[in-house]
């Protein structure tokens, strides 16, 4: 029962993680305006990945897209690749924990084959989480070096001094929701590790049967493996539980729905 | 079409207050920040505050700030403002304008002419 | 406070001349997240109340007239009339848009000989 919880509450975590990650890739406020001495502001300008925007105070706000690839700073570049490399692992690593979930029958998938189904969408999540987090960072280590670069006033003008404000920008709320949703794809993509662990079959010794035919004493070799007669479609061994009872991890449970918001 | 109508002319003691109105009709009221100005006998054009009417939401120029206090009633799509401890300097003509892109002031009502007099 | 400078203070013109009038702010008033400039220019006839031109600097509103020009960027702005009609004898305000409190210059009248 716990590596189903496990294997469950991990496929959740990652799903809040990815769909979190998809959607600070997607939000605009990547980096807002720095309002450090002027709290109310006319003119308030924020950036994401793909555009930037102005939200005037009348209410009006335009954004523009990047159309050039060739004219962006190598480092925004970067960490669109980062997230989008994020996005696409997570969402196979999605598909795959959904084939690997032991509520889920398909077929008469193995153990075997979902801890590695489990294993394998586990790590797809950590790299996922670890490439949303490093996209992130390096967006919030380029803002802080930009941060301190710009001069907050510089003195232009011709014929007098006549003071120029320059706009500093600090970090917006996509660097947050990112930030929670690559832990939260990491953590889950642990979670399916751990889960991994306790799916797969372990090389357990079980009590030697003794059958008795008549007129021939045939015990069968320790090890709870049954001969392959050879007899049905189905020449794979597999282990006796004694009584034939299900464990509680063995019984079937139905996929619960869950809303995504 | 788009249009804001003010409240008539007011006489008014030094000290006492005065609230004056803007009704706005022809567009969605409460989608648009509301400005007022201020425009002595003569003299140039200065900002007062604004108001949006959608939440209340307002922002004052620091200089008015305490004196003036806008208001908005969407049921009767009118805002208000009141200007208190009046002397002879808040003698004026004061306008209501509705603020639209461009931090622009594209509508303007007719002006409501306070004479402050003992 | 940003500080609007208007010039001339007056303009005396003859009908069809072209006429050019200045506005000075203390501080920038081009934003650099869309490369516009947060002027906006009103003209206001005797007893009237003001009628926005031109905003953004150089964004004609509808319904006013080609012959009002808006150009400029940073702190220096102008508004050129380019055929003067008696319509337009006013007083032409600037305005910044850019920053709180929104401030006018002094105005700009013009006459008509």
């Known amino acids: 029962m716990a590596v189903t919880a496990c294997q469950g509450l991990g496929f959740v975590v990652s799903l809040i993680g990815i769909a979190g990650i998809i959607a600070a890739t997607c939000m605009d406020q990547w980096s807002t305006q720095d309002l450090y001495n002027n709290p109310v502001t006319a003119v308030f300008n924020y950036q994401g990945l793909w555009r930037s925007c102005v939200r005037e105070s009348s209410g009006f706000t335009e954004c523009r897209g990047y159309f050039t690839l060739l004219g962006l700073p190598a480092m925004l570049q970067a960490v669109r690749a980062l997230m989008i490399v994020g996005i696409v692992l997570g969402a196979i690593g999605l598909l795959v924990s959904i084939f690997a979930l032991k509520c889920i029958r398909i077929g008469s998938m193995e153990d075997s084959a979902k801890a590695n189904m489990t294993l394998t969408s586990g790590i797809m999540f950590i790299v996922s989480g670890l490439c949303a987090i490093a996209g992130v960072s390096v967006f919030a280590n380029m803002l802080v070096t930009n941060f301190w670069m710009s001069t907050a006033n510089m003195y232009t003008g011709m014929g007098g001094m006549v003071q120029t404000v320059q706009t500093r920008y600090t970090f917006g709320a996509a660097l947050f929701v990112g930030w929670v949703a690559g832990g939260l794809t990491l953590i889950g993509g642990v979670m399916m590790c751990i889960a991994c662990r306790g799916l797969a079959p372990e090389e357990t010794n079980y009590k030697a049967v003794s059958y008795h035919a008549s007129g021939h004493s045939v015990a069968y070799k320790p090890g709870g493996f049954k001969a392959s007669t050879g007899f049905g479609s189905n020449t794979k061994n597999k282990k006796i539980y004694d009584g034939g009872a299900r464990t509680e991890d063995e019984v079937q449970s139905y996929p619960s729905k869950h809303d995504y918001v | 079409q788009v249009q804001l109508q003010q409240s008539g002319a007011e006489l008014v003691r030094p000290g006492s207050s005065v609230k004056i109105s803007c009704k706005a009709s022809g567009y969605a009221f409460s989608s648009y920040w509301m400005n007022w100005v201020k425009q002595r006998p003569g003299q140039g054009l200065e900002w007062i505050g604004q108001?949006?009417?959608?939440?209340?939401?307002?922002t004052y120029n620091g200089k008015f700030k305490g004196q003036a206090t806008l208001t908005a009633d969407k049921s009767s799509s009118t805002v208000y403002m009141q200007l208190s401890s009046l002397t002879s300097e808040d003698s004026a003509v004061y306008f209501c304008a509705r603020f639209v892109k461009g931090n622009a002031m594209d509508y303007w009502g007719q002006g409501t002419s306070v004479t402050v007099s003992s | 406070d940003i500080v609007m400078t208007q010039s001339p203070s007056s303009l005396t013109v003859t009908a069809g001349e072209k006429v050019t009038m200045s506005c000075k702010s203390s501080?920038?008033?081009?934003?650099?997240?869309?490369?516009?400039?947060?002027l906006t220019w009103y003209q206001q006839n005797p007893g009237q109340p003001p009628k926005m031109l031109i905003y953004w600097a150089s964004t004609r509103e509808s319904g006013v007239p080609d012959r009002f020009t808006g150009s400029g960027s940073g702190i220096d702005f102008s508004l050129t009339i380019s055929s003067v009609q008696a319509e337009d004898l006013a007083l032409y305000y600037c305005q910044n848009a850019y920053s709180y409190p929104f401030t006018f210059g002094s105005g700009t009248k013009l006459e008509i000989k």
């Open positions: 501080q920038s008033l081009l934003n650099s997240g869309n490369q516009k400039n947060y």
């Open positions: 108001i949006y009417p959608g939440n209340g939401d307002t």
